[in-house]
Interface confidence: low
Amino acid sequence: DTHKSEVAHRFKDLGEEHFKGLVLVAFSQYLQQCPFEEHVKLVNEVTEFAKTCVADESAENCDKSLHTLFGDKLCTVATLRETYGEMADCCAKQEPERNECFLQHKDDNPNLPPLVRPEVDVMCTAFHDNEATFLKKYLYEVARRHPYFYAPELLFFAARYKAAFAECCQAADKAACLLPKLDELRDEGKASSAKQRLKCASLQKFGDRAFKAWAVARLSQKFPKAEFAEVSKLVTDLTKVHTECCHGDLLECADDRADLAKYMCENQDSISSKLKECCDKPLLEKSHCLAEVENDEMPADLPSLAADYVESKDVCKNYAEAKDVFLGMFLYEYARRHPDYSVMLLLRLAKAYEATLEKCCAAADPHECYAKVFDEFQPLVEEPQNLVKQNCELFEQLGEYKFQNALLVRYTKKVPQVSTPTLVEVSRNLGKVGAKCCKLPEAKRMPCAEDYLSVVLNRLCVLHEKTPVSEKVTKCCTESLVNRRPCFSALELDEAYVPKAFNAETFTFHADMCTLSEKEKQVKKQTALVELVKHKPKATKEQLKGVMDNFAAFVEKCCKADDKEACFAEEGPKFVAASQAALA
């Protein structure tokens, strides 16, 4: 399916609006520090060029690859060297090395100010004054902060953002209408970004085999009535889509995602009974709906797995004939029977099965050797089950904030070398697993919890890769994708860690503390808690609880005082002295 002009092909397939949106996202994800106006100018130039190619595919430069066209455009930015330093060296390279170079310079933690939400009236005026610019600004601001955000999904978020303003800016109480919608979009957006980041890490760090295994397991849970061949086809197509998006090929990715949605809707009968309501929706909504669709009901008459994968005398023959196909079929069969397992657990079981076959198929009596393979699965299954049970009990006992604090202490003791902001961010997100998953019925708890934890721990891994400080973190992040969570769970107090010297400045607070939102106050307190544990890693729960209770009382007292700043200045040193004494 070759085209004389790739840029014309994608422009025609996607339409001008989506084309421009995707190019803006691509450029913003590559050059994260560039001003909005600069990106808009580049996008307009690319769009005008694309239109000339649509008119005449033989026109000059229309035959160039998208990487060449986009890379050439990015390399025209005048301030590239000053703003991005060594990233400017990418421009000296030829494709495909140049694009790889740009990809390697994507920054997961860009030094950008947090997005401040203006007053509702200000936002509504901006929306009405220039809707197109307002929405482009949204794409730009999200994309530059989340350089791996799933681009076609970001277009869906932008459409919802537009709909929220269109509806709420006409409402009697604009704020009451708009703010909950914006909060929901923000939270869903962060979750979507983190989920996609794990997909890209899986592809980039562990290869497409790892991603395909994940996809086989997940799609088999979602579509248990589909044949293996059908699941394999979907996995192949989905892998292509995500490989493209993670590689910066956003136009191809969006185009192929639309093709996949079309295929799924045309073949619902052989995939799932749950797709119908998705397939009536417009493209962006349809693709989102298909990605989030609930698991179909399991066929009633599924035979035992043991017959084909344990009892059969042909196990080793079948395995030897086509290892990946045989393991893929095992994973498919196991996953479609176990929507109650996390994908990561299913992958561990497949890995254990593969290891057993590798060992047993070389043994004198292979059948005797692998006869008990399913028994070996039991401890692998029980470990996450117990973990979810214990942590949900703790969450129910403590509530979210204190549960986060328990995790902060736990993870700071495990990996105290990690920066305090990273420990706070990651532990707060780990703590959100409680509210997200513990209220679910038993059969949905483990897939919810463990697969969510995999996403959060991936964030720790990508941040740590940027500035590695802990061999333990590197080991857990790089050795095995499926065993990351058990690896972190198994870490104990780091005995080799030299406690951080006490710094009174870290525990000095001012009156501005009183004007912070509840969330910001929590982050301040949790930052102090991490610093305490770094100073006294062997402090007991009781000691830390005592100090944190004193801290809360001290802040509350000073925030009620007439002269708040004077109170902080006077009570602060007392709190520090009392804390040191309590932890001595």
Partner: nanobody
Framework: QVQLVESGGGLVQPGGSLRLSCAAS????????MSWVRQAPGKGPEWVSA????????RYAESVKGRFTISRDNAKKTLYLQMNSLKPEDTAVYYC????????VGQGTQVTVSS
């Protein structure tokens, strides 16, 4: 049923070239990485080269680097091995496999390099 049928082998003089083909059926060929493996008389199987499912990533054993090129055509469900500058020590039965497996599925194709 997974089937892999190799062809293109033969007798060739040192320094000559051959192009091997492997026709696949019975599985979603485009979903899997593929390899070429060879087995010389009286020796165990030796992995020669591998290619990922999309064809973008290729790997070679040191002994064949720079002389052999692996490729695939997913539409035709066919794997290829272009062998140039052949040496007597390349003499073996060549067979294709799924993934990095060295387990034989097809019959293989005999390559003999001799003057």
């Amino acid at each position: 049923q997974v089937q892999l049928v190799e062809s293109g082998g033969g007798l060739v003089q040192p320094g000559g070239s051959l192009r091997l083909s492997c026709a696949a059926s019975g599985f979603t060929f485009g979903s899997f990485g593929m390899s070429w493996v060879r087995q010389a008389p009286g020796k165990g199987p030796e992995w020669v080269s591998a290619i990922d499912s999309g064809g973008g990533d290729t790997r070679y054993a040191e002994s064949v680097k720079g002389r052999f090129t692996i490729s695939r055509d997913n539409a035709k469900k066919t794997l290829y091995l272009q062998m140039n500058s052949l040496k007597p020590e390349d003499t073996a039965v060549y067979y294709c496999t799924i993934g990095r497996s060295t387990s034989r599925v097809g019959q293989g194709t005999q390559v003999t390099v001799s003057s």
